[in-house]
């Protein structure tokens, strides 16, 4: 288990961090599932997209999201081990012109249609909390992560090292 102090070293600077350039350094398609292998799916309902966390039927095709990786600049003294690397932020887009957004007031995760440059609410700091799993921390609200609550995506506050590896903020990325 990893202590939260390592996370806080970096996330203290998130409010001030700026994206390096306007283009992602890397993009690829992947399906998103929970730690317990439920799929994250997206459905168009009443001209807006809804996000669901559900078990797929056998051979049912998984929805893909476009993961775009952006380098973030932040003070070098925030680096925990002197590495030269830049913190990575991601945006997630399941369909053209729509991106996952953090709604910090409602503690919800929503799909919004928007144009580039994307707002800060669409950027998430990427973490490797657990082997083969990633977590998404809100750029706009350090310590708050995308998580699963009542079969929906929600924003979950992580306030202790015990909660850092909690299953409901762990996600798997799969290219198949």
């Amino acid at each position: 288990a990893f202590g939260i102090s390592g996370v806080q070293k970096y996330t203290r600077a998130l409010h001030d961090s700026s994206i390096t350039g306007i283009s992602p350094i890397t993009e690829y398609l992947a399906s998103l599932s929970t730690y317990n292998d439920q799929s994250i799916t997206f459905a168009l309902e009443d001209e807006s997209y809804e996000i669901y966390v559900e078990d797929l039927k056998k051979d049912e095709k998984k929805d893909k999201v476009l993961l775009s990786y952006y380098e973030s600049q932040h003070p070098s003294n925030e680096s925990g081990d002197g590495v030269d690397g830049k913190m990575l932020m991601v945006t997630l887009s399941p369909t053209k012109d729509f991106w996952l957004h953090a709604n910090n007031k409602e503690h919800s995760v929503e799909l919004h249609k928007c144009e580039k440059p994307l707002p800060d609410q669409a950027f998430f700091v990427l973490h490797n909390m657990h082997s083969n799993c990633v977590s998404f921390e809100c750029k706009t609200d350090p310590g708050v992560f995308i998580g699963v609550k009542d079969n929906h995506l929600a924003l979950i506050k992580v306030d202790s090292s015990e909660n850092l590896c909690t299953e409901n903020i762990l996600f798997k990325l799969s290219e198949t």
Partner: nanobody, 121 residues
Framework: QVQLVESGGGLVQPGGSLRLSCAAS????????MGWHRQAPGKQRELVAV???????NYADSVKGRFTISRDNSKNTVYLQMNSLRAEDTAVYYC???????????????WGQGTLVTVSS
């Protein structure tokens, strides 16, 4: 500290082949993806190809069908097989990796120093 060391660049004739390698070392906990970018003189750096830990790949349109990216997860090494090389492939090729270290869960972007590929007759 995470280091990326590239090798395999050089001078090759049009239509020829080269294989680039990039090895990552240091306090690596997890590697999310490894990839190659290139920068030609007077141009911006551009993505060539990327391979994820799960084996998914993405290629720039200009190299599809000619370049193949592969990865040895156990060695944290990525390869770029470049066939049917053209003059416009001349550039410095940079290795890029997204990885977390033992001191932090945050995924960071690391770059190699680059290796020069020159395609000329």
């Amino acid at each position: 500290q995470v280091q990326l060391v590239e090798s395999g660049g050089g001078l090759v004739q049009p239509g020829g082949s080269l294989r680039l390698s990039c090895a990552a070392s240091g306090s690596i906990r997890t590697v999310n993806y490894m990839g190659w970018h290139r920068q030609a003189p007077g141009k911006q750096r551009e993505l060539v190809a990327v391979v994820t830990s799960g084996g998914g790949t993405n290629y720039a349109d200009s190299v599809k069908g000619r370049f193949t990216i592969s990865r040895d997860n156990s060695k944290n090494t990525v390869y770029l097989q470049m066939n049917s090389l053209r003059a416009e492939d001349t550039a410095v090729y940079y290795c890029n990796a997204a990885a977390s270290t033992y001191s932090s869960t945050v995924v960071r972007s690391f770059w190699g120093q680059g290796t020069l590929v020159t395609v000329s007759s």
